[in-house]
């Protein structure tokens, strides 16, 4: 990536890291308003299976692993990217390495959920306070989950699907910060590990993933009022280990693995028409990216 100053524009979709033949250090940003990609400052250490989020206008890259010809190291790292300076800086590491992690943000705090360290599949969850640069463990999930999808809705943290070390999962659970407890919610219709999970219009969407046999293109959404999962239109491509985010009322899915190919495809879902469309391609195919959108 280039080390020049990034243009000071809002509402970019950032994609960090990923995997193609080895873990990647790319940071790139897509501008949906004009369809352009920006090449930004590389991660200091390549990583895949990471998660991305934005707090206070800063982009955070959380966990993952560096799978390279020199070895394979799971990451406990938290790194912060400032779009105004186009620079990364390290923050306090998590208590344990977490590859194929999920993250969510509540009240400016980052929740790191599940993931793996070697063959240990975590059910542990920890919360980061940016003002203090500190991590603290909170209540563990009821289920060990890697490749878990995480989303926040109405100040509740949802952990969806994943892999517990033996089985891919259709189960989902919800964390109540005030009570510091997890409760199971209605299971998805489909087993999904490595799905893309996000929130749009008061629903939690789970897109794609892997069911233990095949990559999926199906998409379902959870209505918190009715506590039911309902299928919506499928994506054009089957994909697991995809990136996902929401931008101006639409869902964007980025890359992933279809069982044969590392996808460069970026699809966009319009809930008004219940349709997916191909909107752009990443500069190269990859899986296991961390994705987030800058705030206004």
């Amino acid at each position: 990536g280039s080390m020049g100053h990034a243009p000071k524009v809002g509402r970019l979709i950032y994609t960090a890291g990923g995997y193609f033949r080895q873990s990647l250090s790319y940071l790139e940003a897509y501008n949906p308003s004009d369809g352009t990609w920006l090449d930004l400052a590389d991660l200091q250490v390549p990583r895949s299976g990471l998660a991305g989020c934005v707090v206070g206008g800063l982009l955070y890259a959380v966990g993952g692993r560096n799978n390279s010809p020199d070895g394979n190291t799971d990451s406990s790292a938290l790194d912060c990217y400032n779009p105004m300076t186009n620079q990364w800086s390290p923050c306090a590491p998590m208590s344990v390495p977490r590859n194929r992690i999920g993250v969510g943000v509540i009240d400016g705090h980052i929740y790191a959920v599940g993931g793996s360290h070697g063959c240990i599949h975590h059910n542990s969850v920890e919360r980061y306070e940016p003002e203090r640069d500190e991590w603290h463990l909170v209540a563990p999930m009821l289920t060990r989950r890697i490749g878990v999808g995480v989303a926040v809705l109405n100040r509740l943290l949802y952990a969806v699907g994943g892999f517990d070390g033996t089985n891919r999962l259709n189960s989902a659970e919800c964390y109540y910060p005030e009570r510091n407890e997890w409760r199971m919610i209605t299971a998805m219709n489909t087993i999904r590990s490595g799905a893309g999970v996000c929130v749009l219009h008061n629903c939690i969407y789970a897109a794609g993933g892997y069911d233990g046999q095949d990559q999926l293109n199906s998409v379902e959404r959870y209505d918190v009022e009715t506590e039911t999962w309902t299928f919506v239109a499928p994506m054009k491509h089957r994909r697991s280990a995809l990136g996902i985010t929401v931008h101006q009322g639409r869902i964007y899915v980025l890359g992933g693995y279809d069982g044969h190919t590392f996808l460069d495809s970026v699809e966009c879902y319009d809930p008004d028409t219940d349709t997916w469309s191909e909107v752009t391609r990443m500069t190269s195919g990859r899986s296991g990216v961390g994705v987030a959108v800058t705030m206004e």
């Epitope: 299976g49 799978n67 063959c119 070390g165 490595g194 892997y210 280990a241 069982g259």
Partner: antibody, heavy 121, light 107 residues
Framework: EVQLVESGGGLVQPGGSLRLSCAAS????????IHWVRQAPGKGLEWVAS????????LYAKSVAGRFTISADTSKNTAYLQMNSLRAEDTAVYYC??????????????WGQGTLVTVSS | DIQMTQSPSSLSASVGDRVTITCRAS??????VAWYQQKPGKAPKLLIY???SLYSGVPSRFSGSRSGTDFTLTISSLQPEDFATYYC?????????FGQGTKVEIK
């Protein structure tokens, strides 16, 4: 019945290349992580490479990293090991094996019969 | 890399004997250890996974146990078909590593 059948071994000169195939039947390779393990003549077992069916990520032993490439074609239900820049010390019987869960607690429950690779001038 | 030190490298035993093979990991590997049996010219066969779980179809005379970083394969009453080489394997951390093998021969 679950079966793995390797092919593609043979005699090759140092610096040469070979592509090994592992044809699976009785199960879908898309549902398993596939591993290659080798055994030099009269020696023990050495893990070589693996591919994860969910993420597509591959792992390699340091001794082969940068020279060997593992891949899978789910439409043919076959895994491959492309071996380049071969050395005398790569001489071994190469086995493919499946692991039904991709975590470390699972083990390799089915193995192929092996294919012999000899690197010699 | 985690080293799996297997002992003995070979042993002689008679049919009906109780045989114990040990593998010591150079660091913690939890219970992520498997045991395999290999006969000359053949592929390895899985006996034990997760340190102590007997794989389907394997005779109950085979058992595995763990004590810290020490792992043991026991054959309670050796049968003629058990004369072979046995390997332990750790899959706790990358890269997966095998013990050097124990050859069980007829006394």
């Amino acid at each position: 019945e679950v079966q793995l059948v390797e092919s593609g071994g043979g005699l090759v000169q140092p610096g040469g290349s070979l592509r090994l195939s592992c044809a699976a039947s009785g199960f879908a390779i898309s549902a398993s992580s596939i591993h290659w393990v080798r055994q030099a003549p009269g020696k023990g077992l050495e893990w070589v490479a693996s591919i994860d069916p969910e993420t597509g990520e591959t792992l390699y032993a340091k001794s082969v990293a940068g020279r060997f490439t593992i891949s899978a074609d789910t439409s043919k239900n076959t895994a491959y090991l492309q071996m380049n820049s071969l050395r005398a010390e790569d001489t071994a019987v190469y086995y493919c094996a499946r692991r039904t869960a991709s975590d470390g607690r699972a083990a390799m429950d089915y193995w192929g019969q092996g294919t012999l690779v000899t690197v010699s001038s | 890399d985690i080293q799996m030190t297997q002992s003995p490298s070979s042993l002689s035993a008679s049919v009906g004997d109780r045989v114990t093979i040990t593998c010591r990991a150079s660091q913690s590997v939890s219970s992520a250890v498997a045991w395999y049996q290999q006969k000359p010219g053949k592929a390895p066969k899985l006996l034990i996974y997760s340190a102590s779980s007997l794989y389907s179809g394997v005779p109950s005379r085979f058992s595995g146990s763990r004590s810290g970083t020490d792992f043991t394969l026991t054959i309670s009453s050796l049968q003629p078909e058990d004369f072979a080489t046995y390997y332990c394997q750790q899959s706790y951390s990358f890269p997966s590593t095998f013990g050097q093998g124990t050859k069980v021969e007829i006394k």
